[in-house]
C-alpha cells in the first residue's frame, strides 16, 4: 500500500489557446486530469488501472501552482494504491479549459482540451522527487513525482506491513525495510522476550521484563546460580537443589550433629588439649596447675599435698615450700632423722626398720597414707572419672557420678541407645547426647522409621529430554531442570512450536 504523488509546479500557455489552436474566451481557465496506470510501452487510452485524480481550476493561461499540501492537500496530487508497487508505471496528464463551474468530463465540450502529455518508465519507492518538464508547440508543464509507502508499510514495493508497538506482544519499531528493530532490553522474532539481567543463569533463571533475574524452583541468588539446600540444612551445602552435604565436623541428615565439638566450641580453658569423643562429647587434658571438666579451675601447688611426713606447705610465687616437723628434712620432708623407736607411724600404722635402723617405713591401715600414715586417703585427687564425671568419696571407697550418655566405674563407657536396634525398616541409628536419631531409607519416615511414605519422586525418571530431576524431600515431589530449548513441568515440550490453527 502506497501513494503516487504528483506535484504540479508551473504551466505555460502564453497565447491562451486550446489544443485545436482556438483561443479561450476570455482566457484558458485551466484544470488537470491525471491518469495513472500499469506500464505500457506505448501509452494508450483505456482504464486508469492505478487510479485517477482531478484538480479544481488552478489558474488562467500561464501560472505557477503553489504547494498546497498543508491546506486542502490538493498539491501534490495523491494517487493511493492498495497493492505491491510494481516499480513501473504509465502517467497521462491532461490540461483542460473550464468554461463554467462544472468540471465533469461529460459537461465539457471535447475541444476544451488544452494539452495532453503521456510518460512511462521505472520508478522506485523513495522520498526523492523526480523533476520533469514536458513541452508541446504551445504549452509547457513542469512537475515532479514520487512513490512513497502508506503509513505502516515498508520495503522496496511497500508490501511489508509493520506497526510499531510496545506491549506484551512486542516491543519494537520498524526499520525502513519493514523488519523489526527491538527496543532496548528486548529480543526474539517479535521482540517479546526480555533480555534478563546480565549473567542470569540460562537454565535456572528467567525474567518477565528486561534486566530482571527470577529464579526457578531450587535456585537462589542475584543470578540464580546458587542452589537452595534441603529445608532445615544447618551446617551443609549443595551443588544441586535440595541437597545437604555436610561441612567438615558435622553429620546427620540436616548436618546439625556436631562431630567436632572441640573446634566449633573450644570448651577447654587455660591451654588444655581438647579431644573429641563422640557427638557433642569431648575430654579436656589439663596443663599442670589446672583442673575441672573444662580445666577451668586453677590448682594451688599445695593442693597436691607435696609435703610428706606431716610437713606443712606454703604457696610461693615460683612454687611452694615445705616446713618439715621435727625429725624430717628434705624438699618434701621426705628424709627422716627418726627410727621406729620414736613411734613415727600414726593412725595405727606399723613401723618397719630399714637400712640397719638408719630409717624406717610405715605400713598404713586402709584409708590412710603418707610416709607416716598421717593422711586420710582422698581417692578423688587423681581425677579418675572420665568424660566429665564427678568423683565422690564414699568412706573407704570412691565412686564416679557420670554425665548423661556415659557409664562404667570411671564413666569410661559411652551409653549406646542404638544397641537395641530401635530404627525400623533398615534405618541408620545415630547416638545423640540425650537420646538417638534414626536416618530413614527412601520410602519411610517417623522417629523410628516406622511410617511408610512415598518413594523417591525421581525414581520413575519423570523428566524428558535429558533434563535433571531433583527430589524435594520436604514435599515428596520432583522438579525438572530443563536443558536449553525445552519447557514444561517435565521438559517435554520444545520451545516455539510451528503455527497451527483450528481450521
Amino acid at each position: 500500500s502506497g501513494v503516487f504523488q504528483l506535484q504540479l509546479q508551473e504551466f505555460i500557455n502564453e497565447r491562451g489557446v486550446l489544443a485545436s489552436g482556438r483561443p479561450c474566451e476570455p482566457g484558458c481557465r485551466t484544470f488537470f486530469r491525471v491518469c495513472l496506470k500499469h506500464f505500457q510501452a506505448v501509452v494508450s487510452p483505456g482504464p486508469c488501472t492505478f487510479g485517477t485524480v482531478s484538480t479544481p481550476v488552478l489558474g488562467t493561461n500561464s501560472f505557477a501552482v503553489r504547494d498546497d499540501s498543508s491546506g486542502g492537500g490538493r498539491n501534490p496530487l495523491q494517487l493511493p494504491f492498495n497493492f505491491t508497487w510494481p516499480g513501473t508505471f504509465s502517467l497521462i496528464i491532461e490540461a483542460w479549459h473550464a468554461p463554467g463551474d462544472d468540471l465533469r468530463p461529460e459537461a465539457l465540450p471535447p475541444d476544451a482540451l488544452i494539452s495532453k502529455i503521456a510518460i512511462q518508465g521505472s520508478l522506485a519507492v523513495g522520498q526523492n522527487w523526480l523533476l520533469d518538464e514536458q513541452t508541446s508547440t504551445l504549452t509547457r508543464l513542469r512537475y515532479s513525482y514520487r512513490v512513497i509507502c502508506s503509513d505502516n508499510y515498508y520495503g522496496d514495493n511497500c508490501s511489508r506491513l509493520c506497526k510499531k508497538r510496545n506491549d506484551h506482544f512486542g516491543h519494537y519499531v520498524c526499520q525502513p525495510d519493514g523488519n523489526l528493530s527491538c527496543l532496548p532490553g528486548w529480543t526474539g522474532e517479535y521482540c517479546q522476550q526480555p533480555i534478563c539481567l546480565s549473567g542470569c543463569h540460562e537454565q535456572n533463571g528467567y525474567c518477565s521484563k528486561p534486566a530482571e533475574c527470577l529464579c526457578r524452583p531450587g535456585w537462589q541468588g542475584r543470578l540464580c546460580n546458587e542452589c537452595i539446600p534441603h529445608n532445615g540444612c544447618r551446617h551443609g551445602t549443595c551443588s544441586t537443589p535440595w541437597q545437604c552435604t555436610c561441612d567438615e565436623g558435622w553429620g546427620g541428615l540436616f548436618c546439625d550433629q556436631d562431630l567436632n565439638y572441640c573446634t566449633h566450641h573450644s570448651p577447654c580453658k587455660n591451654g588444655a588439649t581438647c579431644s573429641n569423643s563422640g557427638q557433642r562429647s569431648y575430654t579436656c587434658t589439663c596443663r599442670p596447675g589446672y583442673t575441672g571438666v573444662d580445666c577451668e579451675l586453677e590448682l594451688s601447688e599445695c593442693d597436691s599435698n607435696p609435703c610428706r611426713n606431716g610437713g606443712s606447705c606454703k604457696d610461693q610465687e615460683d612454687g611452694y615450700h615445705c616446713l618439715c616437723p621435727p625429725g624430717y628434712y628434705g624438699l618434701h620432708c621426705e628424709h627422716s632423722t627418726l627410727s621406729c623407736a620414736d613411734s613415727p607411724c600414726f593412725n595405727g600404722g606399723s613401723c618397719r626398720e630399714r637400712n640397719q635402723g638408719a630409717n624406717y617405713a610405715c605400713e598404713c591401715p586402709p584409708n590412710f597414707t603418707g610416709s607416716n600414715c598421717e593422711k586420710k586417703v582422698d581417692r578423688c585427687t587423681s581425677n579418675p572419672c572420665a568424660n566429665g564425671g564427678q568423683c565422690l568419696n564414699r568412706g573407704p571407697s570412691r565412686m564416679c557420678r557420670c554425665r548423661p550418655g556415659f557409664t562404667g566405674t570411671y564413666c569410661e563407657l559411652h551409653v549406646s541407645d542404638c544397641a537395641r536396634n530401635p530404627c525400623a525398616h533398615g534405618g541408620t541409628c545415630h547416638d545423640l547426647e540425650n537420646g538417638l536419631m534414626c536416618t530413614c531409607p527412601a520410602g519411610f519416615s517417623g522417629r523410628r522409621c516406622e511410617v511408610r511414605t512415598s518413594i523417591d519422586a525421581c525414581a520413575s525418571s519423570p523428566c524428558f529430554n535429558r533434563a535433571t530431576c531433583y527430589t524435594d524431600l520436604s514435599t515428596d515431589t520432583f522438579v525438572c531442570n530443563c536443558p536449553y530449548g525445552f519447557v514444561g513441568s517435565r521438559c517435554e515440550f520444545p520451545v516455539g512450536l510451528p503455527p497451527s490453527f483450528p481450521w
Epitope: F169, V495, P502
Partner: antibody
Framework: EVQLQESGPGLVKPSETLSLTCTVS??????????WGWIRQSPGKGLEWIGD???????YYNPSLKSRVTISVDTSKNQFSLKLSSVTAEDTAVYYC?????????????WGQGTLVTVSS | SYELTQPPSVSVSPGQTASITCSGQ??????ASWYQQKPGQSPVLVIY???KRPSGIPERFSGSNSGDTATLTISGTQPMDEADYYC?????????FGYGTKVTVL
C-alpha cells in the same frame, strides 16, 4: 489439535470470589509464542477482555477490573486460572478462556466452549 | 479508556457485499482482528493483522485498516455468514473489543 476447557462452579453468591480454571490440551502452555487470556460475555452483550498471563507468570489485566482480578498459571498441570473477587450480579456472564498468539499480533485463534457463571444469592 | 465503535447491525442480501466498520482513535496504527460468533457458540477468528485470513476461513472474508477505521468485508455473502462480528485491537497491554455488529442475511 489444541483444546481449551473451562471448569468451575456455575453459581457464585454476591460478594464471594468467582474461581475458574482453563485446562489446555494438545499443546504446551509454556510455549513462548502464546499468552493465555480470559474473556467474558454478559447475556445479550458484547465481549469483554478480562486479562491474560504468560507462562513465566507475567500478568496483564483490564484496568476496569484490575482491583478484583487475579490470573495464575500452573505449567506442571498445563492450566491457568481466573479469580474475580467481590462479585455482583453484573459479573454474571459466559466466561471464555482463549489462546493469544504473538505471531497473529495478539489474535486469539483457539477458544474454550465457555462456561456460564451466575451470581445470585 | 480506548474504545472501538461498530454499527449495531448490517443487513445484506445473499450474494451481495457486506461491509462492517470499526472506528477507534488512530486504529490504523494498531493491528485489528475480527471474530465471528454464532448464537450459542464461541467466537472464531476470521481476520488477523488487519487483512490476513487464518487457514480454513473462506476468501470472501477480507479486511483493511487505515486512519481511524478498520473494515471487514464479506463479498458474496451467504446465509451461513449471519452472525455477530466483533473487531478487536490492543491498546498498550489491554485487549479491547468493539461492541459487535449483527449481520443479517435477508
Amino acid at each position: 489439535e489444541v483444546q481449551l476447557q473451562e471448569s468451575g462452579p456455575g453459581l457464585v453468591k454476591p460478594s464471594e470470589t468467582l474461581s475458574l480454571t482453563c485446562t489446555v490440551s494438545g499443546g504446551s502452555i509454556s510455549n513462548s509464542r502464546y499468552h493465555w487470556g480470559w474473556i467474558r460475555q454478559s447475556p445479550g452483550k458484547g465481549l469483554e477482555w478480562i486479562g491474560d498471563i504468560y507462562y513465566t507468570g507475567s500478568t496483564y489485566y483490564n484496568p476496569s477490573l484490575k482491583s478484583r482480578v487475579t490470573i495464575s498459571v500452573d505449567t506442571s498441570k498445563n492450566q491457568f486460572s481466573l479469580k474475580l473477587s467481590s462479585v455482583t450480579a453484573e459479573d454474571t456472564a459466559v466466561y471464555y478462556c482463549a489462546r493469544e498468539d504473538v505471531i497473529l499480533r495478539g489474535g486469539s485463534d483457539y477458544w474454550g466452549q465457555g462456561t456460564l457463571v451466575t451470581v445470585s444469592s | 479508556s480506548y474504545e472501538l465503535t461498530q454499527p449495531p447491525s448490517v443487513s445484506v442480501s445473499p450474494g451481495q457485499t457486506a461491509s462492517i466498520t470499526c472506528s477507534g482513535q488512530r486504529l490504523g496504527d494498531k493491528y485489528a482482528s475480527w471474530y465471528q460468533q454464532k448464537p450459542g457458540q464461541s467466537p472464531v477468528l476470521v481476520i488477523y493483522e488487519d487483512s490476513k485470513r487464518p487457514s480454513g476461513i473462506p476468501e470472501r472474508f477480507s479486511g483493511s485498516n487505515s486512519g481511524d477505521t478498520a473494515t471487514l468485508t464479506i463479498s458474496g455473502t451467504q446465509p451461513m455468514d449471519e452472525a455477530d462480528y466483533y473487531c478487536q485491537a490492543w491498546d498498550r497491554d489491554t485487549g479491547v473489543f468493539g461492541y459487535g455488529t449483527k449481520v443479517t442475511v435477508l
